[in-house]
């Protein structure tokens, strides 16, 4: 039975040209995390495998940095980065847990600063 829950940052905003940390947290389960996939809509951004480390998709290599932890840092944000992001936790023996984050990249310099994981 899957007892775990995924906590995410929910809806966040950031300024164009800035950076943001995407983070999810799996709790309430003793299952071992074997891999975390980060996806934007249907596009793979990165994989963090417990045995093989990080893999960043080539098309994002120059502006995605792994971490902190199992999180992902997006840099040099553009308006095109606006959209849904998913963290997909592969665990044993529970199976797969998925979390959703919506990122809005704003043109103006008055992006909300309430995002819990936002970095300057």
């Amino acid at each position: 039975m899957m007892t775990g829950t995924i906590e995410t940052t929910g809806n966040i905003s950031a300024e164009k040209g800035g950076s943001i940390i995407l983070q999810c947290h799996l709790s309430s389960t003793t299952a071992q995390v074997t891999q975390v996939n980060w996806e934007q809509q249907d596009q793979l951004l990165a994989i963090c495998n417990a045995d093989l480390g990080w893999h960043i998709s080539p098309s994002f290599k120059d502006r995605v940095a792994p971490g902190p932890g199992l999180g992902l840092t997006l840099q040099s944000l553009t308006v095109n980065d606006t959209g849904e992001y998913f963290c997909i936790y592969h665990t044993y023996p529970d199976g797969t847990y998925t979390g959703r984050i919506f990122l809005e990249v704003l043109e103006s310099s008055v992006a909300e600063h309430g995002a819990r994981f936002q970095i300057p």
Epitope: I21, V33, G53, W54, D62, P68
Partner: antibody
Framework: EFQLQQSGTVLARPGASVKMFCKAS????????MHWVKQRPGQGLEWIGA????????NYNQKFKGKAKLTAVTSASTAYMELNSLTNEDSAVYYC??????????WGQGASVTVSS | DIVLTQSPATLSVTPRNSVSLSCRAS??????LHWYQQKSHGSPRLLIK???QSISGIPSRFSGSGSGTDFTLSINSVETEDFGMYFC?????????FGGGTKLEIN
């Protein structure tokens, strides 16, 4: 087998610079952060910073910005840390460790730096 | 920066007894907490990742619990090889930080 092999003991004068290495083997060097940690005699662990060879991303402890410079040569699977303007406070054992998102699971044997005039 | 406070600084224990070591964070780090053991003149060794996840090769007598700001490393029936320093470390945000350590010594 995974291994992180660090430089040997270094004795340096105050004001000098030292550059130490951490040679990785047994895994894909570009897939893991390489962290550097300082430990003064009888003291705890202090995080200096980390370098990600996959795209040269870095993160530093603010305290060590300007003191430590982290680099790597991916073709040699070797990470480097340079410490400049050495003082007695820099006398310590320095560890490298790898992290792929799941804790620092492998550590080097440590490199001892002694600053003395 | 997130400050991790470990207590007690020193813990004296008789072999085969069980002990608990505490690590408290200055703000919530959710489950991004790892534990390390360091024996005299040795390198640190990862014991537990993400609060409670086990590490291959680490004896099952080591276990972890907690979330948010309060965490515990438990050693069920301490053995002589367990004596040394124990450190917690957070990976919730940069910069990563370590706790000051707990020294586990023979009573």
């Amino acid at each position: 087998e995974f291994q992180l092999q660090q430089s040997g003991t270094v004795l340096a004068r105050p004001g000098a610079s030292v550059k130490m290495f951490c040679k990785a083997s047994g895994y894909s060097f570009t897939r893991y952060w390489m962290h550097w940690v300082k430990q003064r005699p009888g003291q705890g662990l202090e995080w200096i910073g980390a370098f990600y060879p996959g795209n040269s991303a870095t993160n530093y402890n603010q305290k060590f910005k300007g003191k430590a410079k982290l680099t790597a040569v991916t073709s040699a699977s070797t990470a480097y840390m340079e410490l400049n303007s050495l003082t007695n406070e820099d006398s310590a054992v320095y560890y490298c460790s790898r992290e792929g998102g799941y804790g620092m699971d492998h550590w080097g044997q440590g490199a001892s730096v002694t600053v003395s005039s | 920066d997130i400050v991790l406070t470990q207590s007690p600084a020193t813990l004296s224990v008789t072999p085969r007894n069980s002990v608990s070591l505490s690590c408290r964070a200055s703000q919530s780090i959710r489950n991004n907490l790892h534990w390390y053991q360091q024996k005299s003149h040795g390198s640190p060794r990862l014991l537990i990742k993400y609060v409670s996840q086990s590490i291959s090769g680490i004896p099952s007598r080591f276990s972890g619990s907690g979330s948010g700001t309060d965490f515990t490393l438990s050693i069920n029936s301490v053995e002589t090889e367990d004596f040394g320093m124990y450190f917690c470390q957070q990976s919730n945000s940069w910069p990563y930080t370590f706790g000051g350590g707990t020294k586990l010594e023979i009573n």
